[in-house]
Each structure stands twice: as structure tokens, then as C-alpha cells.
């Protein structure tokens, strides 16, 4: 049944879409932008715990005006996903969940097989998407590639098809600040900067609270990241014009611990004034 | 380390040339913006090494507002805004490293104090 | 054997949870989708929603979007439904039933024994 | 949702007798993949429904052939060619094209 007039199945099994995709929602995914080369999807690794991987495969007649040639019903239809060490399976869906198709990995998730139906029948048209966990990606991961293979026992010569995307790790960093008052004055009398002792004979105070946040997973290989902060010293003419005190990195060095920036602030030595702080 | 601006005894100052004096006496409305990236004002950066943190690092900074300049240069201002800036950067071998959103400005406006009497 | 076997009997208040659970046997737990349906005394067949115990998508009756939760845990082979903010309407016996995958066995074909939940005060 | 309407509510048959219940759903149930997911059950007295006829006509494993069903679209039968005592119950209709699946509302077969 399903194998025409020869009784022979030769089905027509095509992968017609592989694509990465951004997941928006449990069951909504959106194609990932295209490299120059227009068969490369860019993937910038923004905090993003998944991938997910479009397939659409057919079972339809090469050549429409010779229908009985191929295209018959493929018995234990299957498609054959090999991920690559950055990449772990972690399910499976579908826009229509009867074409939800049942895959099942091995142990470590490197290796999936989708059941599309015993038989995937003549005219046969199905779209899904795997979800692939990117918790294995590194800084040092260039490219994704999974590699796919279809698979019948019906009369079909199949070959691996590569899926590939060109990764971009984009640090899931971002940057706020505040400035404590965020208005000064100034007033009194001028005095030269031999007579400043202490902070509180300087001007007034103010305090900068800049965070980095972190929405992304651990970042384990931050040793070369830096916290800059262009502080505006001097006016034009080499005159004073914000006076930095002390200049303290709370977190970004490991638990406790409070981080030494360089160049050293109050270059002055002038007397800390302990209530400020 | 940080240099120290140019010092000058108090008596000492010279009459500011007028390529860099900010106003004319008869400028009093005028607004100001210092900020290194405008080239009104020098800078320099504080570099902090981020070293490992899971969710957020805070960069405290205490400073004080160098009156005597505010004094001598811009009493007849009606407002100046000095802008503070602060970025990430990554070093990396690594071509494929992108960061995006990775600077913030923190304008703070600075006046004259309105009960205040300028000693001409 | 395929069986389903489900817990017992449960008399609640009006506002509190119901968790029901139903235990797998005699095939592959995850090959097949797990369905709830309940049924109100005297009346018909409601659907309530489906568990894919392979990946633990769900996908619910819009009717009891906010108030059913499904679960399932692999090791055990047990399927749970938990219902909140119980009201006397959801009075019913509760099945969990069998269906298939990638639209076949797009229907039950085992069900449970039922589950009898009064919601009384 | 899709509503699905049964009828009658209740039918006396004499054991031996043929009997008929029709199922009329509000939308087409024939899904993109051309498989049409109509489906009979049968609820005994006491017991959990049972699954007999699926995707139209095709009978569930050990469901004597004297059931049998029919139909397309939104029209579909279940037809029983001689009653026996032992097929009492509520038959209940059941669409799966369409989330969410929905039932008939049951057809309550009888011995006169």
C-alpha cells in the first residue's frame, strides 16, 4: 500500500529547509539573519540558552508530470541529527502539534533521531523545530554545524546535509550609571591648591554608582575585561575640574573582594573625609 | 600615574588667554558642557579589571567638584553639565567578540549657588 | 500490559489544589503523549490539556490555561495534573489517557481508571 | 472550538437490531496532512471510555467488526450492524484535528 503500481516504495525523502532560529516563544521561532553568503546564519550568543534548528522535510514526487516514479510512502521514515560538542539536544517542537515529531537523544544529547512516521506518506509535508541548548558554547566557538541525515527502507539514496551558522559572541553585558546628587554647586571663595588639606576643602561632593550587569550565563573567561570610566579632571586650561577621591570596583573579582583600578585617584593626598563614604 | 594639573600659587594666576575662556562677561545666560569626547574638558580613565562575576560589578567613584575653577572660570555661567562616561572594553584574541551597549553617559549640571557671593 | 494507573479518590475546599497522578507501565513512557479529560457527573468529555513526557511540552484547553499544571517524571514513568483554585464545577472524575505521536494514534487509545475529585466545603 | 453534536441523546435497540449515531462537527475535521482525526469511544457503565473506531473507520484491536464508521468533512456515522446486550453505554464522538480536542456530547445506547 502506498508503493504504486510496482509495488516497490521508492520514496522521495527531501530535507527542503535547515535553518537556525532564534526561539521567541514555547512554540514561535524566528529565522536567525543571513551571513554575505546567503547559506551562513549568524548566531549572537546574547544570553541566549537556546537555539532552535527549523527542518522541513517532504516526501513529495521529484518530477510532478511523472508522479509514480518516487515520492511513494517512506517506511520508518527518520532524520538522523548530529550535533557538534557546543550544541545538546533539548526538545523538539512544532507550530501544528501533529507534525511534532518523536525524537529521542542519546545520553549526552550529541545525538537525536526524529520518527517521521512509519509511513511518512506519499505527499507528505512536515515542519518542526529542534531545540538546541547553547550552554555548550565557549568564546572560542566560531561556527555551529549539525550535520543531518535522512533515513527509509524504502528505495531511497540519501546523503548528510550540513546546517551552519557563523557565531558571534556578543557579551550579554550592559552598562548603567548614576551620579549622586545629580546636581552640584558651587560657591565661597577661591583658594589655590596648596591650601587644600582635606576633600571637604576642595568643593562639593558627589558620588558615581556605575553597574555592570550581567544578563547572560556565568561568563567564565572575563580575565581580559575592563571597566573604564572617563573621568573629567581638568577643564581645557589644566584647571581642576572634578577632583576623584576614591575610586572602589565592588564584584567583578570574586566573592568578597573589592577591586583595585589604576590609576590611583587623590593624587593629592588630601584628608578622606570618612563621613562621605 | 595621574598628573596632577598645572599648579599655580594663588596670587600667581595669569589672565586666561581668549582662545579657551568659556564667557564674555556679557554672556551671562550661557550653557556649558564639559566633556572629554567634545573636547571641553580632559579626562582620565579609570580602568577596573573585571575578573569574574556572575550577574553585576559596581563601580563606586567619590569626587569632589573643584570649586576654585567653577569660581575663577564660570561664575557667569547660568549652567554647566559635566558629563562622566563609562564603557566595557574586551581585550581578546578572539575576532568574533561583540559587545553591544557597552558604554553609558551620567551628565551632572553644576551652578552657581544662588545665595552665594562671588568675590570679584 | 499497557496500564495506566491513577490515585485515589480526593475531597477538597473550594480555592485549594488537586494533584492527580497516573502511573505508566508496559511501554515506552516517552513515546507517547499524555492526555487529560475529565468528566463532570452525569455529563460528557472535557480535554484538558497533553504532556509530551519525552520534552515536557504541554499544551492546554485556553479553559484551564491558568489553573492546570502538567507534569511528568521520566524516572518513575508517572504523569501528573495539578488544578488550582478549585471551584464545586471541577467536581469530576479525572482520566489521564494515552495518545500517540506525529498525528498517529492521534487518539486514546488506554486510559486510566479514573480519578474521582469532590470539591466540596 | 470546535463543537461536535450528537445524535440522538439516548437510543433504545432491541439486541440483534442494527442502530445508528450520527456526529456533526462546526468545522471541516480533515487536517492539512489529509488525515481526518474523527474518533468513536465507548463509555460501559462504571468504567473509563474505551476507544473503537479511529480516524473515521478504522477499528480499534479487538473491537468486534459488527461496529463500523463512515463519513467526511463534518458529517460522520457510527453504525452498529446487530446490538448485543454487552454494547451498552454512552458512545461519545471525538475530534483531535483541532486544538483543543473535543468530544460529542454522548449518545446513550440502551436494551428495550
Known amino acids: 500500500q502506498g508503493c504504486g503500481e510496482d509495488k516497490i516504495c521508492q520514496s522521495n525523502l527531501q530535507l527542503v529547509r535547515a535553518r537556525f532560529c532564534t526561539r521567541v516563544s514555547d512554540t514561535e521561532f524566528q529565522p536567525l539573519p543571513m551571513d554575505v553568503d546567503g547559506t551562513t546564519a549568524l548566531f549572537a550568543l546574547s544570553g541566549q540558552p537556546v537555539i532552535g534548528l527549523e527542518l522541513m522535510v517532504t516526501n513529495l514526487p521529484s518530477d510532478p508530470a511523472q508522479p509514480q516514479a518516487d515520492g511513494d510512502d517512506a517506511h520508518e521514515a527518520q532524520l538522523l541529527v548530529m550535533l557538534p560538542d557546543s550544541l545538546h539536544y533539548s526538545g523538539v517542537r512544532a507550530l501544528d502539534p501533529a507534525e511534532k515529531p518523536l525524537c529521542l537523544s542519546n545520553e549526552n544529547a550529541s545525538h537525536v533521531e526524529c520518527e517521521l512516521g512509519n509511513p511518512m506518506k506519499r505527499g507528505a509535508q512536515v515542519t518542526f523545530y529542534l531545540i538546541l541548548s547553547t550552554s555548550g558554547i565557549s568564546i572560542e566557538t566560531t561556527e555551529l554545524e549539525v550535520e543531518l541525515l535522512l533515513a527509509t527502507i524504502s528505495e531511497q539514496e540519501l546523503h548528510p546535509v550540513s546546517a551552519r551558522a557563523r557565531v558571534f559572541i556578543e557579551l550579554p553585558l550592559s552598562i548603567a550609571g548614576m551620579a549622586i546628587p545629580q546636581q552640584l554647586f558651587f560657591s565661597g571663595v577661591v583658594r589655590g591648591e596648596r591650601a587644600m588639606q582635606s576633600e571637604r576643602d576642595v568643593g562639593s561632593k558627589v558620588k558615581y554608582e556605575v553597574t555592570v550587569s550581567n544578563q547572560g550565563q556565568s561568563l567564565r573567561t572575563l580575565g581580559s575585561a575592563f571597566l573604564n570610566i572617563m573621568w573629567p579632571h581638568e577643564i581645557a586650561n589644566g584647571k581642576w575640574l572634578l577632583y576623584p577621591m576614591q575610586v572602589e570596583l565592588e564584584g567583578g573579582q570574586g566573592p568578597g573582594q573589592k577591586g583595585l583600578c589604576s590609576p590611583r585617584p587623590n593624587i593629592l593626598h588630601l584628608d578622606v573625609d570618612s563621613r562621605d563614604r | 600615574e595621574l598628573e596632577p594639573p598645572e599648579q599655580q600659587e594663588p596670587g600667581e594666576r595669569q589672565e586666561p588667554s581668549m582662545s579657551w575662556w568659556p564667557v564674555s562677561s556679557a554672556e551671562k545666560k550661557k550653557n556649558i558642557t564639559l566633556d572629554c569626547a567634545r573636547g571641553t574638558a580632559n579626562c582620565v580613565v579609570f580602568s577596573c579589571p573585571l575578573y569574574s562575576f556572575d550577574r553585576a560589578a559596581v563601580l563606586h567613584v567619590w569626587g569632589r567638584l573643584w570649586n576654585s575653577t567653577f569660581l575663577e572660570e564660570y561664575s557667569a555661567v547660568k549652567s554647566l553639565e559635566v558629563i562622566v562616561r563609562a564603557n566595557i572594553t574586551v581585550k581578546s584574541s578572539i575576532k568574533n567578540l561583540m559587545l553591544r551597549d557597552a558604554s553609558t553617559v551620567i551628565p551632572v549640571m553644576v551652578y552657581l549657588d544662588p545665595m552665594a557671593v562671588v568675590a570679584e | 500490559e499497557v496500564q495506566l494507573v491513577q490515585s485515589g479518590a480526593e475531597v477538597k475546599k473550594p480555592g485549594s489544589s488537586v494533584k492527580v497522578s497516573c502511573k505508566a507501565s508496559g511501554y515506552s513512557f516517552t513515546r507517547y503523549w499524555m492526555h487529560w479529560v475529565r468528566q463532570a457527573p452525569g455529563q460528557g468529555l472535557e480535554w484538558i490539556g497533553k504532556?509530551?513526557?519525552?520534552?515536557?511540552?504541554?499544551r492546554l484547553n485556553q479553559e484551564f490555561r491558568d489553573r492546570a499544571t502538567l507534569t511528568v517524571d521520566k524516572s518513575t514513568s508517572t504523569a501528573y495534573m495539578e488544578l488550582s483554585s478549585l471551584r464545586s464545577e471541577d467536581t469530576a472524575v479525572y482520566y489521564c489517557?494515552?495518545?500517540?505521536?506525529?498525528?498517529?494514534?492521534?487518539?486514546?487509545?488506554?486510559w486510566g481508571q479514573g480519578t474521582l475529585v469532590t470539591v466540596s466545603s | 472550538d470546535i463543537v461536535m453534536t450528537q445524535s440522538p441523546l439516548s437510543l433504545p435497540v432491541t439486541p440483534g437490531e442494527p442502530a445508528s449515531i450520527s456526529c456533526r462537527s462546526s468545522q471541516s475535521l480533515v487536517h492539512r496532512n489529509g488525515n481526518t482525526y474523527l474518533h468513536w469511544y465507548l463509555q460501559k457503565p462504571g468504567q473509563s471510555p474505551q476507544l473503537l473506531i479511529y480516524?473515521?473507520?478504522n477499528r480499534a484491536s479487538g473491537v468486534p467488526d459488527r461496529f463500523s464508521g463512515s463519513g467526511s468533512g463534518t458529517d460522520f456515522t457510527l453504525k452498529i450492524s446487530r446490538v448485543e446486550a454487552e454494547d451498552v453505554g454512552v458512545y461519545f464522538c471525538s475530534q483531535s484535528t483541532h486544538v483543543p480536542w473535543t468530544f460529542g456530547g454522548g449518545t446513550k445506547l440502551e436494551i428495550k
Open positions: 504532556i509530551d513526557p519525552s520534552d515536557s511540552e504541554t
Open positions: 489517557a494515552r495518545g500517540g505521536y506525529f498525528g498517529e494514534q492521534w487518539y486514546h487509545d488506554v
Open positions: 480516524e473515521v473507520s
